[in-house]
Interface confidence: low
């Protein structure tokens, strides 16, 4: 089993749609279960500390350049939710996301109809197959939602930011 999220970071605009892509290949002939899981930032991207002191985060970050204070912390220190899961052709939304325009398309891509402020964070695409347990079964993408127009939005490459008409 091999799971790949092609975009490691996605920047999109508030109230606009986005698609988080996920590809997988498997030797299994059984239908795969696709699950998208959301993990909030360990600290607020806009600077306020959430769950971990920024001073501690920065000192740890200095010692280990691979450690990211925004993304790397125990799940107990941040919000973790199931966004949606798909088995066969049936898509089920997590409790927190019920009523939202969210679905799983093209086998494993997460489609969000209208982004909200709280959608910024880390999204994990997790694939489970009953008879292919070897390899990598998950990958992640960071989604950063910007509530901006003008220069900042326009300079984002089209494959990273999506600004679509209502």
């Amino acid at each position: 089993l091999q799971v790949t999220v092609p975009d490691k970071k996605k920047v999109a605009m508030l109230f606009q749609p986005t698609v988080l892509r996920c590809h997988f290949s498997t030797s299994s002939h059984q239908p795969a279960v696709v699950q998208w899981k959301f993990k909030s930032y360990c600290q607020d991207r806009m600077g306020e500390s959430l769950g971990m002191s920024s001073t501690r985060a920065q000192s740890l970050s200095k010692r280990n350049l691979e450690w990211d204070p925004y993304l790397d912390c125990l799940d107990s220190r941040r919000t973790v939710r199931v966004v949606a899961s798909k088995q066969g052709s049936t898509v089920t939304l997590g409790d927190f996301y019920r009523g939202r325009e969210i679905t799983i398309v093209h086998d494993a891509d997460l489609q969000i109809g209208k982004l909200m402020w709280g959608d910024s964070g880390l999204y994990y695409c997790i694939i489970t197959t009953p008879d292919d347990l070897e390899g990598k079964n998950e990958d992640s993408v960071e989604l950063l939602v910007l509530g901006r127009t003008g220069l900042l939005a326009d300079l984002l490459p089209s494959f990273a930011v999506e600004i679509m008409p209502e």
Epitope: K8, E142, G150, L151, L155, S158, F159
Partner: antibody
Framework: EVQLVESGGGVVQPGRSLRLSCAAS????????MHWVRQAPGKGLEWVAV????????YYADSVKGRFTISRDNSKNTLYLQMNSLRAEDTAVYYC????????????????????????WGQGTTVTVSS | EIVLTQSPGTLSLSPGERVTLSCRTG???????IAWYQQKPGQAPRLLLY???NRATGIPDRFSGSGSGTDFTLTISRLEPEDSAVYYC?????????FGQGTRLEIK
């Protein structure tokens, strides 16, 4: 080695035109937004213009709007600044600068990283507007 | 456009000392869009920090940044002779990009 080399500066009379070039090497030029920043003699830095990675979006400082045009040729790895109706106050060293990739925040690539500053600068080319 | 005001304008300190440079923005700026640069005489600027507090590649850990809203700071914990330079803060905004007027740091 990542490098930016500006050229095209010189002495020009007020009201005339000049075209600056910035040759890029050592990185995938077509993936990054590019800026022009200038510095008048003995003064601070002043941002002039920015162009998106593919040239489709351009923004200018109010002081140059309508007179300067930023453009790029990704096939030649070159950034340009066409300066028309030059004024004495345009006298400055002109730097081209590259958007920074998101160093240290994960392996993110090829997206506009205004979040991360300008990480590579040329050595500058001097423009003097004088009669 | 957002105006950035840096203080002090000039300061002179000795090697080994700690210094904090201030950058105040005319209106609230998300700290994701604040950067600091160092410029030595006759040279191009050099990126020090982005996102208000993240060090750029190759920048020693003597340099650190903090702040939010309208007040941002650059701190150099142990001054070295080579830190003598002008330091600029910079912000990205929808309306454009602006730099502060700079703080000149002299090492005695």
């Amino acid at each position: 080695e990542v490098q930016l080399v500006e050229s095209g500066g010189g002495v020009v009379q007020p009201g005339r035109s000049l075209r600056l070039s910035c040759a890029a090497s050592g990185f995938t030029f077509s993936s990054y937004g590019m800026h022009w920043v200038r510095q008048a003699p003995g003064k601070g830095l002043e941002w002039v213009a920015v162009i998106s990675y593919d040239g489709s979006n351009k923004y200018y400082a109010d002081s140059v709007k309508g007179r300067f045009t930023i453009s790029r040729d990704n096939s030649k790895n070159t950034l340009y600044l066409q300066m028309n109706s030059l004024r004495a106050e345009d006298t400055a060293v002109y730097y081209c600068a590259k958007e920074s990739p998101s160093v240290g925040l994960g392996s993110y690539y090829d997206f506009w990283s205004g979040l991360y500053g300008m990480d590579v600068w040329g050595q500058g080319t001097t423009v003097t507007v004088s009669s | 456009e957002i105006v950035l005001t840096q203080s002090p304008g000039t300061l002179s300190l000795s090697p080994g000392e700690r210094v904090t440079l201030s950058c105040r923005t005319g209106q609230r700026v998300e700290n994701l869009f604040i950067a600091w640069y160092q410029q030595k005489p006759g040279q191009a600027p050099r990126l020090l920090l982005y996102g208000a507090s993240n060090r750029a590649t190759g920048i020693p850990d003597r340099f650190s940044g903090s702040g939010s809203g309208t007040d941002f700071t650059l701190t150099i914990s142990r001054l070295e002779p080579e830190d003598s330079a002008v330091y600029y803060c910079q912000q990205y905004d929808d309306s454009g990009i602006t730099f502060g007027q700079g703080t000149r740091l002299e090492i005695k």
